[in-house]
Interface confidence: low
């Protein structure tokens, strides 16, 4: 409508007793320039006068003249565009409406904005993301609806009433579009800020409180498990029992499903929190865990190495080198699968017992002839002796001896 | 360097209390503070704890009824009241903190600072 002035301005500014409002504000006269401007408090229009009566904050006129009682109340306007105010302090009876009568040689209008101004500083507003989930980065916002140059505010981040190390970005806007001050705050939650609780506190420029909100984090995450095993070392014999109980300390959203894993490919029929092995052979040594899965996906626990101990195993030896060359060195070794590892050994040349070797290896730096023939060993540990394996044949070549004619 | 100074302990008769402190010197965060003890010849057994975020608490079952823990985050400090002692609980306690969330708080292995410990003698 060509017939109007043009404002622009936000519609509602808030404040707090004893804090200051910044009014943005531009407009576009009718015609030529301002020439009078008053700021009414509650403005209302008296048909009988044809002018508006009510609280008069500022009154600016040709000759320029402003009343002393109004210096907490300032026009930083000027006469064709800009109609931006600053009222500091600012008092709670300063709520209401604010009438911005503003008149030119030939027009007059009268533009109104809304003033709310609390007893006490008002609280921020905390937003935060939909869904939050472990380890995935999120922005926590803290928004206030206020901003005043002559008023400086900051907003902290605590977490469980201490204040967050993440460095936070505050931003202000005084735009004819919005008033706000406003904190960001890049966080990646880990599983146990699960309920926990987010402040953002109103500071004043020397850090005094004036207010705060507060959020409880609801952060999804995979089941938390601790895997508990009977004995508790995880060394058992052949034959014995073991129980692996699996507990769940923390799952957001609530478990689903439970199975077991051994060396990484899970147990079939296995989908209790209790697994139970009765009379363990030695083949079910190895690594254990839980697994617990809910709509964020799949937990493990920690690993547990079951260790089952088992007597020696029948042994065999390995010949470094055969056939030898007499006079070469050779060397020998009994290997034998045994849990815990053997700690003895018995070696055999051609079934008789060779006196004084009890290692694993025997060394012999010398080959001679009568060194050739079949080499055994039998292992030990602590729960007992292996048997003897079919043993290695050692050749043994050399040059002829005591050469004779025919 | 944290500093965990528990204090408190001494001679009491069966059936009377006493109230053990224990203050963490520094400003430092901690989520979680508990008391554990340990009797002569006996493993080190854990007796009350507090999470801080929603003043949580959980207690071992042969003291429940009769200890009661609560604490001030803000001072780092926590207290134990014993009550109905006996002279089962002869042991010395000790104070702890999880710094750290690490899941139980019952388990001895959750907790990152100790102190050295308060002798509660309980005879008549």
């Known amino acids: 409508d060509s017939s109007k002035w043009v404002f622009e301005h936000p519609e509602t500014l808030y404040a707090w007793e004893g804090a200051c409002v910044w009014i943005p504000c531009t407009y576009r006269a009718l015609d030529g320039d301002l020439e009078s401007f008053i700021l009414f408090h509650n403005p209302e229009y008296n048909k009988n006068t044809s002018k508006f009566d009510g609280t008069r904050l500022y009154e600016s006129t040709k000759d320029g003249k402003v009343p002393s009682e109004q210096k907490r109340v300032q026009f930083l306007g000027d006469k064709n565009k800009n109609c931006t105010l600053s009222i500091h302090p600012v008092h709670l009876n300063d709520s209401g409406q604010l009438g911005l009568r503003m008149e030119s040689k030939t027009e007059k209008w009268m533009e109104r904005i809304h003033l709310n101004v609390s007893e006490r500083p008002f609280p921020p507003h905390i937003q935060l993301p939909p869904e939050i989930q472990e380890s995935q980065e999120v922005t926590l916002t803290c928004l206030l609806n206020f901003s005043c140059y002559g008023y400086p505010i900051q907003l902290q981040w605590l977490l469980e009433g201490v204040p967050m190390r993440q460095a936070a970005v505050t931003s202000t806007s005084l735009t004819i579009k919005s008033v706000f001050t406003r904190s960001e705050l890049k966080f990646s939650p880990q599983w146990s800020h699960h309920g926990k609780i987010v402040t953002c506190q109103l500071q004043d420029a020397d850090g005094k409180f004036l207010s705060n909100d507060t959020v409880q984090l609801n952060v999804k995450h995979t089941p938390k498990l601790e895997i508990k095993v009977t004995p508790s070392d995880a060394i058992v014999r052949e034959g014995d029992s073991v129980t692996m109980t699996c507990e769940v300390s923390s799952s957001n959203p609530e478990y689903t499903t439970v199975s077991w894993l051994k060396d990484g490919t899970s147990l079939k029929k296995q989908n209790t929190f209790t697994l139970n092995l009765r009379e363990v052979t030695k083949d079910q040594s190895g690594k254990y865990c839980c697994q617990v899965s809910n709509d964020v996906g799949p937990g493990r626990s920690e690993e547990v190495f079951l260790q089952v101990q088992y007597a020696p195993e029948p042994s065999t030896v390995q010949i470094l080198h055969s056939p030898a060359v007499e006079g070469s060195q050779v060397e020998f070794l009994c290997m034998s699968l045994a849990n815990p590892l053997p700690t003895n050994y018995t070696w055999y040349h051609n079934g008789k017992e060779m006196q004084g070797r009890t290692e694993e290896k025997v060394h012999i730096p010398k080959i001679l002839p009568w060194h050739a023939g079949t080499y055994s060993c039998v292992a030990e540990n602590i729960l007992g002796t292996g048997q003897r394996g079919p043993g290695a044949e050692l050749d043994v070549q050399y040059p002829p001896k005591k050469v004779t004619t025919v | 360097q944290v500093q965990l100074v528990e204090s408190g302990g001494g001679l009491v008769q069966p059936g009377g209390s006493l109230r053990l402190s224990c203050a963490a010197s520094?400003?430092?965060?901690?989520?979680?503070m508990g008391w554990f003890r340990q009797a002569p010849g006996k493993e080190r057994e854990f007796v009350a704890g507090i999470r801080w975020s929603d003043s949580k608490t959980y207690y071992a079952d042969s003291v429940k009824g009769r200890f009661t823990i609560s604490g001030d985050n803000a001072k780092n400090t926590t207290y134990l009241q014993m009550n109905s002692l006996k002279p089962e609980d002869t042991a010395v306690y000790y104070c702890?903190?999880?710094?750290?969330?690490?899941?139980?708080?019952?388990?001895?292995?959750?907790?990152?600072?100790w102190g050295q410990g308060t002798q509660v003698t309980v005879s008549s």
């Open positions: 520094g400003s430092w965060f901690n989520i979680a």
């Open positions: 702890a903190a999880q710094r750290y969330y690490r899941g139980s708080y019952n388990r001895q292995t959750n907790y990152d600072h």
